[in-house]
């Protein structure tokens, strides 16, 4: 089958890095600076991408393989391929529409991006509360209170606020 | 590539509980929190609930407070969602779905769907 | 505990555009994602965040976000577009989802 497909279209013959040229009696051709094509056969290139601004190179462009970008210090990447970056908080906040925002009690954020999440209810998994938690931090949950012995007592954090105008926007 | 393969159909009593299983491949199981979210026949999404693969930490939609237990097992690169005191009204599709990147909690890939049916 | 309200079912003419509207107090504030379910199958993310699309997802999916509705917005209907489509934000502690709409390609 391989054979005969490359009987039929000279193209198939054309290996990664290469494009078939039509204005050259469809021989395979090198990508042109700036261009790459990741499989055989290609009837083009495609451009490089190019990181530029708040996105750097992690990884430069070949001519069978795509540059890959990331973001420069004080920015992280968001979607598939790093399509966008955006704004570094500190621990302890999350990044609101409005600018970084502190994460309201019993909630907490561990990375510089993403969202504040309310801390574990331990309970609700049969457990006791080992360590409270923070703006930054979990709680850490530990053995169920039946495990305690006798006398251990175990801390457990207030509910986490609710109030509509304290919720994470 | 990226994958969740979540276990086979189970058939249980009401009053039964069922645990449900899913698999994940091709990324860092503990680099991402994986969510269970339910769809009974003919009807919308309904969330249940989260585990944080690296720690374990979870949080769960206050209908389900009680009732469900999401858990991992970083070994297996698996989480876990048990729901007990089953009643014929949690007959539904279970799905588990890896929470992406964007800044509020999106599902970027799913599993299967596991169906569970709770009938006398 | 916050609401997502949208229309049940939409109804398109193959080519037009698509418009599936998410109504919920100062959406505008929250960020909105968008799945799309073909039946018996798993849902698929085709916008996060108010208007980014995943990869793969094509550029006719389009999405906007502000004031009290969130819309997801598909030029050139196909056939193949025809499935339901949730909107879903993150509120407070929990993760919440519109009850659907489907989307019939006339």
């Known amino acids: 089958f391989e054979r005969t497909r490359s009987l039929q279209d000279p193209c198939s013959n054309c290996p990664a890095g290469t494009f078939c040229d039509n204005n050259r009696n469809q021989i395979c051709s090198p990508c042109p600076p700036n261009s790459f094509s990741s499989a055989g056969g290609q009837r083009t290139c495609d451009i490089c991408r190019q990181c530029k601004g708040v996105f750097r190179t992690r990884k430069e462009c070949s001519s069978t393989s795509n540059a890959e970008c990331d973001c420069t210090p004080g920015f992280h990447c968001l979607g598939a391929g790093c399509s966008m970056c955006e704004q570094d908080c500190k621990q302890g906040q999350e990044l609101t529409k409005k600018g970084c925002k502190d994460c309201c009690f019993g909630t907490f954020n561990d990375q510089k991006r993403g969202i504040c999440r309310p801390w574990t209810n331990c309970s609700l998994d049969g457990k006791s509360v080992l360590v409270n938690g923070t703006k930054e931090r979990d709680v850490v949950c530990g053995p169920s209170p039946a495990d305690l012995s006798p006398g251990a007592s175990s801390v457990t954090p207030p509910a986490p606020a609710r109030e509509p105008g304290h919720s994470p926007q | 590539q990226m994958q969740l393969v979540q276990s086979g159909a189970e058939v249980k009593k009401p009053g039964a509980s069922v645990k449900v299983s899913c698999k994940a491949s091709?990324?860092?199981?503990?680099?991402?929190?994986m969510h269970w979210v339910r769809q009974a026949p003919g009807q919308g999404l309904e969330w249940m609930g989260w585990?944080?693969?690296?720690?374990?930490?979870?949080n769960y939609a206050q209908k389900f407070q009680g009732r469900v237990t999401i858990t991992r097992d970083t070994s297996a690169s698996t989480a876990y969602m048990e729901l007990s005191s089953l009643r014929s009204e949690d007959t539904a599709v279970y799905y588990c779905?890896?929470?992406?990147?964007?800044?509020?909690?999106?599902?970027?890939?799913w599993g299967q769907g596991t169906l569970v049916t709770v009938s006398s | 505990s916050y609401e997502l309200t949208q229309p049940p079912s939409v109804s398109v003419a193959p080519g037009k555009t698509a418009r599936i509207t998410c109504g919920g107090n100062?959406?505008?504030?929250?960020?909105v994602h968008w799945y799309q379910q073909k039946p018996g199958q798993a849902p698929v993310l085709v916008i996060y965040?108010?208007?980014d699309r995943p990869s793969g997802i094509p550029e006719r999916f389009s999405g906007s976000n502000s004031g009290n509705t969130a819309t997801l917005t598909i030029s050139r209907v196909e056939a193949g577009d025809e499935a339901d489509y949730y909107c879903?934000?993150?509120?407070?502690?929990?993760?919440?989802f519109g009850g659907g709409t489907q989307l019939t390609v006339l």
């Open positions: 965040y108010d208007s």
């Open positions: 779905a890896r929470e992406g990147w964007a800044r509020r909690i999106d599902l970027d890939e």
């Open positions: 879903q934000v993150w509120d407070s502690s929990s993760v919440v």
């Open positions: 100062n959406i505008g504030s929250k960020s």
């Open positions: 091709g990324y860092s199981f503990t680099g991402y929190y």
């Open positions: 585990v944080n693969p690296k720690s374990g930490g979870t």
